[in-house]
Each structure stands twice: as structure tokens, then as C-alpha cells.
């Protein structure tokens, strides 16, 4: 992890990097590696992509072990093929208001994505896209046969917008905080970021936190009950310790993770909180990192990686952080 030892590189030839990712010397000047990209974890040995103006932000001087690849102050953003200046706000579509800050984009939804539970007035609630309307709206399908009252269908669950209002006014500052982005990894340790000006100087700043939607080694499909298609929040059998680039959390955590579905839906964090976690490294150094902890998950068809970059961005976000 650090550069104190002699150079030791893998025997294979230099790695092949994905398109747009630079092949660079590691931070020790030893081996050629694929540069880490914006928002990825970085170390002294795993440097960030210098050709994109990225540097490894360790957060505080005490945490010189593991950082997050961050754009230099004032770096522009490329979003949907358009370049935006740092500090510039833009409407990426009728559904989202976004802000570029030092190479990172944070977006806030403009559409309410409420959830509706069945009732006598609306036994079969559905969200639909109406012609000429940007935001989806609720429609209430009446039972096909009005004389038969069937069981109420489960609420059509897209995404909730419950939790604190992201916009409030405080002492000449319109406080704005974007949602936490989805975790950068669908399993294992990743990064989630947001942009906020909720600070004493009312200046936009980026915040990041570690996140783990589910462990990579977990075979969750085995736990799905017979006749069911999903396991939303699997029961955790034993407390675990988190690992981060060779460092281990000092405490054990009975953390919740999101499950899986067998019918094409994906399960993602729905309500989360942010807590500090202390990691102890092999050399005895202790570092504190903020980490996402899952309260509840939701299973839905709005899975990440779909064609519409706005949709995947929007539906992957986590709302209602209760830190």
C-alpha cells in the first residue's frame, strides 16, 4: 500500500485499461497501472488519472492511507456530452436540476416520486407517463369487474421522495443538498457522493461516504422463500467487520444489506444513514471514514445501467438520509 518496500510488479505485461482510462505509473514510480477515475478509491500505489486533473483526496492529514479521486478545484464536468463549468447549474432534463462542482455533478429531482398505498378510492394505484406532462402521475385503475372486490394490489413502487426537504433557507443562504448518488459498486465497498452548501460559508462542497449495498460473496438468491421472487432486506446472520484496502473496521457491525430478485428487478438502498467508521491498518494507523448504513431497501424495475443516463442516475439515488 505504501512505497517503503522495493518495487514488485506483476509478471504480466502492462494492463489493458478501459477506453478513456489512462495507463500511468503507480504513485511509487514502479509499475504501470490503470489510473483510478473520479469518485473511485485511491491510495499511494493506486493513483488517480492525472490527465483528467484528478488527485487523491485523503480528506484529512491523519487519513493518508485511502482517499477518493477528486477533481481539482474549478474542474469542469462533462455530462451527457456537454461541458459545464464548476459552479454552473443546469437542468439536465425536465426532471432534474443539476450542479457541477469541481468535476462532480450532483442532481436533485424536480418531480415528486411519491408512493401510493391502495385505498377504497384507489384500489389499484399506478404511476404513468401522461402525454404532454414531464413528471409521471398517479392513476387509479378501477377493478375490471366493478361487482367483484379483489384483493388490493401492492402499491406500484418506483422511488420515494420522503425525508427532509433538500431545500431550505438559512441566514441569507439557500441551502441545497443533492441526494447521495447511488453506490459506485453493486457489491463490495464503493463510494457515494453528494454536493451541498450546508456549511458556515454557504459554499458548494463535495461530500463522499463509503457504501456497501451487499457483500460480493453473498449468495442471496438461495434465501428467497419458495413462491417469492425477491428477498428485499436479507437477515444478517452475524456481525461483520468492514475491510478497506487492507484496513479493517475496529468495531463489528450488524449491518443491513439489500437483497436480490429473480424476476429482473433490482434491490437498492431506500432509506440510509451516514455514520463514521474507524479503520485500523496493518501498520497500526487508524483512519475515520463516513459510511452509508442501510435502513431499508426497495426492489424495483428501475435498475441502474439503463439507456437513459438521467433515469439511471435518478432511480439509483438514495433518499432520506437520516444522519
Amino acid at each position: 500500500q505504501n512505497c517503503s518496500g522495493p518495487c514488485r510488479c506483476p509478471d504480466e505485461p502492462a494492463p489493458r485499461c478501459p477506453a478513456g482510462v489512462s495507463l500511468v505509473l503507480d504513485g511509487c514510480g514502479c509499475c504501470r497501472v490503470c489510473a483510478k477515475q473520479l469518485g473511485e478509491l485511491c491510495t499511494e500505489r493506486d493513483p488517480c488519472d492525472p490527465h483528467k486533473g484528478l488527485f487523491c483526496d485523503f480528506g484529512s492529514p491523519a487519513n493518508r492511507k485511502i482517499g477518493v479521486c477528486t477533481a481539482k478545484d474549478g474542474a469542469p464536468c462533462i455530462f451527457g456530452g456537454t461541458v459545464y463549468r464548476s459552479g454552473e447549474s443546469f437542468q439536465s432534463s425536465c426532471k432534474y436540476q443539476c450542479t457541477c462542482l469541481d468535476g462532480a455533478v450532483g442532481c436533485m429531482p424536480l418531480c415528486s416520486m411519491d408512493v401510493r398505498l391502495p385505498s377504497p378510492d384507489c384500489p389499484f394505484p399506478r404511476r404513468v407517463k401522461l402525454p404532454g406532462k414531464c413528471c409521471e402521475e398517479w392513476v387509479c385503475d378501477e377493478p375490471k369487474d366493478q361487482t367483484v372486490v379483489g384483493p388490493a394490489l401492492a402499491a406500484y413502487r418506483l422511488e420515494d421522495t420522503f425525508g427532509p426537504d433538500p431545500t431550505m433557507i438559512r441566514a441569507n443562504c439557500l441551502v441545497q443538498t443533492t441526494e447521495w448518488s447511488a453506490c459506485s459498486k453493486t457489491c463490495g465497498m464503493g463510494i457515494s457522493t453528494r454536493v451541498t452548501n450546508d456549511n458556515a460559508s454557504c459554499r458548494l462542497e463535495k461530500q463522499s461516504r463509503l457504501c456497501m449495498v451487499r457483500p460480493c460473496e453473498a449468495d442471496l438468491e438461495e434465501n428467497i422463500k419458495k413462491g417469492k421472487k425477491c428477498i428485499r432486506t436479507p437477515k444478517i446472520s452475524k456481525p461483520i467487520k468492514f475491510e478497506l484496502s487492507g484496513c479493517t473496521s475496529m468495531k463489528t457491525y450488524r449491518a443491513k444489506f439489500c437483497g436480490v430478485c429473480t424476476d429482473g428487478r433490482c434491490c437498492t438502498p431506500h432509506r440510509t444513514t451516514t455514520l463514521p467508521v474507524e479503520f485500523k491498518c496493518p501498520d497500526g494507523e487508524v483512519m475515520k471514514k463516513n459510511m452509508m448504513f442501510i435502513k431499508t431497501c426497495a426492489c424495483h424495475y428501475n435498475c441502474p445501467g439503463d439507456n437513459d443516463i438521467f433515469e439511471s442516475l435518478y432511480y439509483r439515488k438514495m433518499y432520506g438520509d437520516m444522519a
Partner: antibody, heavy 114, light 110 residues
Amino acid sequence: EVTLKESGPVLVKPTETLTLTCTVSGFSLSTFGVHWIRQPPGKALEWLAVIWRRGGTDYNAAFMSRLTISKDTSKSQVVLTMTNMDPVDTATYYCARDGGFDYWGQGTTVTVSS
Amino acid sequence: ETVVTQEPSLTVSPGGTVTLTCRSSIGAVTTSNYANWVQQKPGQAFRGLIGGTSNRAPWTPARFSGSLLGGKAALTLSGVQPEDEAEYYCALWYSTHYVFGGGTKLTVLG
């Protein structure tokens, strides 16, 4: 963010008419119905009335002759009037959104006394 | 007059399971009663937990589940947490009106 807020007089004299307003935000009254519920001190909840998304209304039969519920969708307001108030009507009055009674207002306490 | 009856109080230990029920005086509760469960924690506003018999609100933890059990509406809490201590009300729909139960005061020991 979905919110409901009740407003109205704190003190009402016996035989007078109580008018309560529920002002909502974060959803449309053309999409969701709104219920009125009350809770007398130390007692259980009591359902009073509902105005549905399409404007239809239903009432608790015990109060039907005394209650009227209406809405102004453009103002996002639902109004409940209760005539011939009596000291036994002293309670905290709540409005709640239809659909699992998912969101409630904080309630407004009404005392009926001469 | 239709009466909806709930257990006045129940006590459970943390981590335990408890079932709150909601009985109708005019027969078995069915899905057409659209059973709702509402929670009020001390000093907090009411909020809906379950609607339409078994549908959870977005903020309702997975340990809460709504069902029909033996002709009654039921709210089952498995793996009870200290923060689940609250008053729970059920409400049933009867074609033209709702009726609330008397409420169950759930106490979590410890």
C-alpha cells in the same frame, strides 16, 4: 415533501360552528383524498369524514347531519365544518392523506367551552 | 354500530415477535376492508405504516408485516426494536366509512 397542516380556532363556544382548514403541499388534491380524524383527550381516534380525489364525500354516520367537507384544489385546501358544537367535541382534530393514512398533520386542539 | 377491537396493551422483549390484531364486530375482516395500521410514537405525529391490508409505506421497516389472520387484520413485528414502542391503531373500511380501533399500546421491555 408531503405536508398537511390543520388550522382553525382554538376555542369554540357551545352551539357554534367549527370551521377547520387543512392545507396540503407535496401532492395534489385531484390525486389523493383527505380524511379528517379526531382524538378526544385520553381517548382513541375517531374517523369523521373524507373527501375523495374526484370530489365525492363520505361521513361518519354519527356526525353526518353536523359535518360538511369540501375542497379547493387550486388552493390545496380541504375544509371541514362541524355545526352545533358541544363540550364533548373537545379534541385534537387531524387531517390525513388517503392511501394508508400515510401522512398526517400535527393536529389542532379545539376546546368547546362557554 | 360497528366496533373495531384491538388489544389495549401488549409487552414484548427486544428481538422478540409480537402480533397486534384488529377484530370487526360484524364478521371476518377481508381485503375489501382495506385494513390500515397507523403508528404514533410519544411526542411525534401519527404516520401510516400499512395500507390495503399488507402494503408497507416507504418508511416502514421490513420487520413490520400486515396480513389477515383468523378473520382478523394483523400487524406482526418480528425482531422488535426499542424504537417500536408506540401506540398502534388499525382502521377498517366499511363501504361508506372508516372505523378506528381503540389502539394498542406496545411496550418494549428493557
